[in-house]
């Protein structure tokens, strides 16, 4: 339904509070370096303009598209060229090219200072002094650091952030109440950002078809009682929502997400028996709850898949008539029967089935040709099962930190050209699969582990894309979305790599390490480990482990010393010399 004024339409649908929050998120995700005050000023100007359009949809400029309005507003920023360089050239373009240009300049790893959490009393004072500014600042800081964060979900995080301060700033022990809540929000926020980044990468790098295939598989696992037509409708709507959010159309995205939640709740009887509780919640909680809802029980007595997809004489006829619909039905039927498979595995099976039909439906005897297609699935299923079994055993043996270290060594040897901070960040996240998924029973391990690994490897892909340094990473990231994990798993040690020259500065440590949190200290040690492997890629696991133990002994000794800085200087030189002698650095 066409509206005379798109901006008035969205303002009325969303309400002023959500409208302002979403415009702030949109602007912060585009102009990630701009100061908070500048963004607030732009948002206020847009909001005032929207109000004039609500009052009179025929007023001047009210008929312009949101991209035109927002792009024009962003292009008024005086310091655009100094701050953003070539991004300023976007402003010379017309829509829709201008928006595409802004999107291409989103930075997954912006050069912004780490967010340091102030003292609890300082935060509570700021919260009480000006709650609105305090919450806007939260939206701004998260959005600029996570330019693909799912905007309507960020509104949900902000609501929980506000609730935490409202409750805890009145508590007897403010810190005990607030800090665990903030830690939880931070960890959940990072996970949410990474999951959404994969959705946007799927859409932007592999197209709508790839995203829809992912959505069919996931929704079919989640709603196995729903008919194929129902799942297809949900997939179409969900694809629209994510296409909008990934494209910077945050107002449309939030509006359409609310409509989708409303539709799901109005039709829950034909979708899932697990939605009841979600549908009783307010909008933001409802949408979040639906997105996280557990899989419904599988219908009893589902027939064998072979009848329709292998044994039937009409397979090629049905495939030829509507290829994507037929493949969608295959994926739907397979996924609803297999909540124990990862989505990426289901997509690999569907791809194998498609390839087989493409080949066999052109053969002399198609049925004879595709009769054994399900046998081809066996190795595809066993590969992730075996990998998860091995890695969970290793995780249980080593614990999270040492499991991360094993992965750090493994991945640094595979792709040593990748920057050390990226290798540390990605390997630490890969290592978290252990505590996240290995506790689950067999039936839940694969969907947990492999789909999580897809999210983490996408982080590697988007960070690497910004500054490509490894052909092997580029190849694994771009060839096939669903085969990224197997591609990385299959990489062996890079024999072409020329070891990095030794630089003593890399292995110089100071007394500040003693006051770091356990996590930060681990990151320092893991950074040293990556550098060590880059210098000595042929070092054995045992040698690396032993050198890292020497490093731990050195840090522990110097952190207990009276003159810590002198100890780090003197003993650090000895440690480097000893490691050089032992490893021949």
């Amino acid at each position: 339904d066409a509206h005379k004024s798109e901006v008035a339409h969205r303002f009325k649908d969303l309400g002023e509070e959500n409208f302002k929050a979403l415009v702030l998120i949109a602007f912060a995700q585009y102009l990630q370096q701009c100061p908070f005050e500048d963004h607030v000023k732009l948002v206020n100007e847009v909001t005032e303009f929207a109000k004039t359009c609500v009052a009179d949809e025929s007023a001047e400029n009210c008929d312009k598209s949101l991209h035109t309005l927002f792009g024009d507003k962003l292009c008024t920023v005086a310091t655009l060229r100094e701050t953003y360089g070539e991004m300023a050239d976007c402003c010379a373009k017309q829509e829709p090219e201008r928006n595409e240009c802004f999107l291409q300049h989103k930075d997954d790893n912006p050069n912004l200072p780490r967010l340091v959490r102030p003292e609890v009393d300082v935060m509570c004072t700021a919260f009480h002094d000006n709650e609105e500014t305090f919450l806007k600042k939260y939206l701004y800081e998260i959005a600029r650091r996570h330019p693909y964060f799912y905007a309507p979900e960020l509104l949900f995080f902000a609501k929980r952030y506000k609730a935490a301060f409202t409750e805890c700033c009145q508590a007897a022990d403010k810190a005990a109440c607030l800090l665990p809540k903030l830690d939880e929000l931070r960890d959940e926020g990072k996970a949410s950002s990474a999951k959404q980044r994969l959705k946007c990468a799927s859409l932007q790098k592999f197209g709508e078809r790839a995203f829809k295939a992912w959505a069919v598989a996931r929704l079919s696992q989640r709603f196995p009682k729903a008919e194929f037509a129902e799942v297809s409708k949900l997939v179409t709507d969900l694809t629209k929502v994510h296409t909008e959010c990934c494209h910077g159309d945050l107002l449309e995205c939030a509006d359409d997400r609310a409509d989708l939640a409303k539709y799901i709740c109005e039709n829950q009887d034909s979708i899932s028996s697990k939605l009841k509780e979600c549908c009783e919640k307010p909008l933001l909680e409802k949408s979040h709850c639906i997105a996280e809802v557990e899989n419904d029980e599988m219908p009893a007595d589902l027939p064998s898949l072979a009848a329709d997809f292998v044994e039937s004489k009409d397979v090629c006829k049905n495939y030829a008539e509507a290829k994507d619909v037929f493949l969608g039905m295959f994926l739907y039927e397979y996924a609803r029967r297999h909540p124990d498979y990862s989505v990426v595995l289901l997509l690999r099976l569907a791809k194998t089935y498609e390839t087989t039909l493409e080949k066999c439906c052109a053969a002399a005897d198609p049925h004879e040709c595709y009769a054994k297609v399900f046998d081809e699935f066996k190795p595809l299923v066993e590969e992730p099962q075996n990998l998860i079994k091995q890695n969970c055993e290793l995780f249980e043996q080593l614990g999270e930190y040492k499991f991360q270290n094993a992965l750090l060594v493994r991945y640094t040897k595979k792709v040593p050209q990748v920057s050390t901070p990226t290798l540390v960040e990605v390997s630490r996240n890969l290592g978290k699969v252990g505590s996240k998924c290995c506790k689950h029973p067999e039936a839940k391990r694969m969907p947990c582990a492999e789909d999580y690994l897809s999210v983490v490897l996408n982080q590697l892909c988007v960070l690497h894309e910004k500054t490509p340094v490894s052909d092997r990473v580029t190849k694994c990231c771009t060839e096939s979305l669903v085969n990224r994990r197997p591609c990385f798993s299959a990489l062996e040690v890079d024999e072409t790599y020329v070891p990095k020259e030794f630089n003593a500065e890399t292995f110089t440590f100071h007394a500040d390490i003693c006051t770091l949190s356990e996590k930060e200290r681990q990151i320092k040690k893991q950074t040293a480990l990556v550098e060590l492997v880059k210098h000595k890629p042929k070092a054995t696991k045992e040698q690396l482990k032993a050198v890292m133990d020497d490093f731990a002994a050195f840090v522990e000794k110097c952190c207990k010393a009276d003159d810590k800085e002198t100890c780090f200087a003197e003993e650090g030189k000895k440690l480097v010399a000893a490691s050089q002698a032992a490893l021949g650095l």
């Epitope: 614990g399 032993a546 020497d550 002994a553 207990k560 000893a578 002698a581 032992a582």
Partner: nanobody, 124 residues
């Protein structure tokens, strides 16, 4: 299973020297740091020295620094503790231990395999 056997302890005068040996068998000796600890009657077991996997890095307790020297011969799967200028307060049972996979390098809990100990007595 790792076996550690200490030898070389005995009764000496203050100011004398002793050399303790610890022979290892079992898992790859050269992959792990080794530690020397001691325990005097009625006291906790305390750290004396740590020598790293390759023998290139040693750490000592302040009380023995400059007097004791740890070394190792990976070809012989043996670690040594050369003790000079011995004092009566060095009297204790001396243990060698092989480093575990976690825990402190200066605490007995960070070491996985232990010898049976050898008595060192320093008379004044």
């Amino acid at each position: 299973q790792v076996q550690l056997v200490e030898s070389g302890g005995g009764l000496v005068q203050a100011g004398d020297s002793l050399r303790l040996s610890c022979a290892a068998s079992g898992r790859t000796f050269s992959d792990y740091a080794m530690g020397w600890f001691r325990q005097a009657p009625g006291k906790e077991r305390e750290f004396v020295a740590r020598i790293n996997w390759s023998g290139t890095l040693t750490y000592y307790a302040d009380s023995v620094k400059g007097r004791f020297t740890a070394s190792r011969d990976n070809a012989k799967n043996t670690v040594y503790l050369q003790m000079n200028s011995l004092k009566p307060e060095d009297t204790a049972v001396y243990y060698c231990a092989q480093r575990g996979d976690s825990g402190s390098n200066y605490d007995p809990s960070g070491y996985r395999y232990w010898g049976q100990g050898t008595q060192v007595t320093v008379s004044s």
